[in-house]
Interface confidence: low
């Protein structure tokens, strides 16, 4: 016998308590597959969070993060403040990078120059702490 | 460009049944769901049905039990039957798209029907 | 079923008014409330939907609130092609009823 519930599309919910009828997703809730006997509530983007895309009743809102943070985590689970390149966020907030290291994105952490003695290279053009050195040719 | 288009016998004798057509374009009944509503000269809007994209439907419980909805995805059709017909079936007859949190964005013109002998 | 009223069968109003429509539902919607116009010609479109929510390319004169059972469409600046009969519709409950219209008429 065939689940009466299958008939139910995404954007709706199988509604027990009146005879298993395909009843709509209430606002700010949504099923993104067939079959469902609840729908799920909407992800809602506040604070830091903002709205990338929309709930809808059949797929949830999206968040990516205010000006000034970054994503972080599978499906922007968190937003993370960004610093300037040459610097790195650390727990007392974004700090320089040490001489010999460099970061070039507003995230993440300083890495250290190439070394380019080890490829038998000289140095071509200095680093800084936005940009890796320049390894030119052997010497 | 989102169209719904009503299609239907514009007379019908009391007693018989009403087949009315939607066809839609620019949409597929696959993700969309498709509402019919009636009005009476001179009265207001009445919601007969529903039928969602995976086929289920959803009726007015004043006219369950002579009415049906069903479509044909491929042929981009909604249809809708009525049995034992009166005259106060007399109508305009819109099909409408579900959309969104189930409103209806998007009206079909409209197509008069009227019961008489 | 759940009864939808709209109280004013009709109304008389100046161009560049503000003009207010009530419906009120007969037992509470949560918010579940759409609003249409349709034009003398039989033309329905789609205004407003979950109470205030203003759908595409409709004029920003429009707008919508309430809550339980009592909601209200306002125009703040009528315009002549306003001219039209204005329906709410909940969608709490099955069957989904419409409210019995207002028809709006410029003075």
């Known amino acids: 016998l065939q689940d009466p519930c299958s008939n139910c599309p995404a954007g709706t919910f199988c509604d027990n308590n009146r005879n298993q009828i395909c009843s709509p997703c209430p606002p700010n809730s949504f099923s993104s597959a067939g079959g469902q006997r609840t729908c799920d509530i909407c992800r809602q983007c506040k604070g830091v969070f903002r709205t990338r895309k929309e709930c809808s009743s059949t797929s949830n809102a999206e968040c990516d993060c205010t000006p000034g943070f970054h994503c972080l985590g599978a499906g922007c689970s968190m937003c993370e403040q960004d610093c300037k390149q040459g610097q790195e966020l650390t727990k007392k907030g974004c700090k320089d990078c040490c001489f010999g290291t460099f970061n070039d994105q507003k995230r993440g952490i300083c890495r250290p120059w190439t070394n380019c003695s080890l490829d038998g290279k000289s140095v071509l053009v200095n680093g800084t702490k936005e940009r890796d050195v320049v390894c030119g040719p052997s010497p | 460009q989102v169209q719904l288009k009503e299609s239907g016998p514009g007379l019908v004798a009391p007693s018989q049944s009403l087949s009315i057509t939607c066809t839609v374009s620019g949409f597929s009944l696959t993700t969309y769901a498709i509402s019919w509503v009636r009005q009476p000269p001179g009265k207001g809007l009445e919601w007969l049905g529903i039928?969602?994209?995976?086929?289920?439907?959803n009726y007015n419980s004043a006219l369950k039990s002579r009415l049906s909805i069903s479509k044909d995805n491929s042929r981009s059709q909604v249809f809708l039957k009525m049995n034992s017909l009166q005259t106060d079936d007399t109508a305009r007859y819109y099909c409408a798209r579900g959309a969104g949190t189930w409103y209806f964005d998007v009206w079909g013109a409209g197509t008069t029907v009227t019961v008489s002998s | 079923d759940i009864q939808m009223t709209q109280s004013t069968s009709s109304l008389s109003a100046s161009v560049g008014d503000r003009v207010t429509i009530s419906c009120s539902a007969s037992?509470?919607?949560?918010?579940?409330l759409n609003w249409y116009q349709q034009k003398p010609d039989g033309t329905v479109k789609l205004l407003i939907y979950?109470?205030?929510s203003l759908h595409s390319g409709v004029p920003s004169r429009f707008s919508g609130s309430g809550s339980g059972t009592d909601y209200s469409l306002t125009i703040s600046n009528l315009e002549p092609e306003d001219i039209a009969t204005y329906y709410c519709q909940q969608y709490s409950k099955f069957p989904w009823t419409f409210g019995g219209g207002t028809k709006l008429e410029i003075k």
């Open positions: 979950y109470t205030s």
């Open positions: 037992q509470g919607i949560s918010n579940y």
């Open positions: 039928i969602w994209p995976g086929g289920g439907t």
